[in-house]
């Protein structure tokens, strides 16, 4: 079965710094999403080879991509405290497949010592339950489509 390898599990960075999240699969995708989880999940990007990436307005100008949709590294720049959260990759194949999540902790520089990542991956219990038809070792949110809310339409 298709899987999404996502790394890192957790990262602590100061305000203004950058973070890399990598989503790797065995191929055969239609595209991949990075979504910030929460009561109101928010799509951050949609990436599909050969198509202009879709980026949510909040991250416009702060996102870079390297690699391909099968092995994608997403770099989020100039992080703000409000960017703290769990981000998950969603690979679109014939089913939905999810990464294990990356907990990004953005801290004020002087308080970094108080907020550190443990070695454990983000707890699945903190994430919403998956749709019944999804293939998943990892529970997350369901399928998505490109073109951001309140963001300019991209081809």
């Amino acid at each position: 079965a298709q899987e999404v390898q996502q790394s890192p599990h957790c990262t602590t960075v100061p305000v203004g710094a950058s973070v890399n999240i990598t989503c790797s699969t065995s191929g055969g995708l239609r595209g991949i999403y990075l979504r910030q989880l929460g009561p109101q999940p928010q799509d951050i990007i949609y990436y599909e080879d050969g198509v202009v990436p879709t980026t949510d307005r909040r991250f416009r100008g702060r996102i870079d991509f390297s690699g391909s949709q099968d092995n994608l590294t997403i770099t989020m720049h100039r992080l703000q405290l409000s960017d703290t959260g769990t981000y998950t990759c969603q690979a679109i194949t014939e089913v939905n497949v999810y990464g294990s999540g990356t907990l990004v902790l953005v801290t004020e520089e002087q308080s970094q010592g108080w907020h550190r990542c443990s070695d454990a991956p983000p707890r699945a219990s903190a994430l919403p339950a998956p749709p019944t038809g999804s293939a998943l070792p990892d529970p997350q949110t369901a399928s998505a489509l490109p073109d951001p809310p309140a963001a300019s339409a991209l081809p």
């Epitope: 999940p41 949609y46 749709p131 490109p146 809310p149």
Partner: antibody, heavy 117, light 107 residues
């Protein structure tokens, strides 16, 4: 049992507006993308718009700039705001659950929108 | 946009007959094809997704096959309750597009 119930259809004059609603029950609404599909009288199916669980939206060229799809996860509701309506928008509008980005596995009963002077 | 061409547009067959409906895409769609059934005056229902996977509750007389640009829906033994219009739909690329439909009637 998953259920989708549309409302808000009716008769409107060309250039007018309508807001369709779709109330969902029996599913974790916030976990699913949702779509609107329409069917003109005696015609086939036409995809109109979709919104992901995370809020990304997409529209058919025929409605882009006139229709807006949105959702309220707290109310388990999907919406379609339709502005600048034309006679060719006359159709039954269905909301559908989008299981895997285009795999529309549950449909509502539909609501009829008639655009006529 | 990907165009979906369905044939025939209508057919009439006897109960127990094997019925085949074809759908052709204007470009390869990598098996991202669904089939829907719409009975007269009713809501469309998903029959088959991803070319050949039977949706839950759908009778096994329905099957799907195909690859690349050409896809087929087969009803192995037509039943009176199968009178309906059948639509194919590609979901390889946005915008999602449907075939024009095939109306199936009983002789």
């Amino acid at each position: 049992e998953v259920q989708l119930v549309e409302s808000g259809g009716g008769l409107v004059k060309p250039g007018g507006s309508l807001r369709l609603s779709c109330a969902a029950s029996g599913l974790t609404f916030s976990s699913y993308a949702m779509s609107w599909v329409r069917q003109a009288p005696g015609k086939g199916l036409e995809w109109v718009a979709s919104i992901s669980s995370g809020g990304f939206t997409y529209y058919a060229d025929s409605v882009k700039g006139r229709f807006t799809i949105s959702r309220d996860n707290a109310k388990n509701s999907l919406y379609l705001q339709m502005n600048s309506l034309r006679a060719e928008d006359t159709a039954v509008y269905y909301c559908a659950r989008d299981e895997v980005r285009g795999y529309l596995d549950v449909w509502g009963q539909g609501t009829l929108v008639t655009v006529s002077s | 946009d990907i165009q979906m061409t369905q044939s025939p547009s209508s057919l009439s067959a006897s109960v127990g007959d094997r019925v085949t409906i074809t759908c052709s895409a204007s470009q390869g769609i990598s098996n991202y094809l669904n089939w829907y059934q719409q009975k007269p005056g009713k809501v469309p229902k998903l029959l088959i997704y991803y070319t050949s996977s039977l949706h839950s509750g759908v009778p096994s007389r329905f099957s799907g096959s195909g690859s690349g640009t050409d896809y087929t829906l087969t009803i192995s033994s037509l039943q009176p309750e199968d009178v309906a219009t059948y639509y194919c739909q590609q979901y390889s690329k946005l915008p999602y597009t449907f075939g024009g439909g095939t109306k199936v009637e009983i002789k």
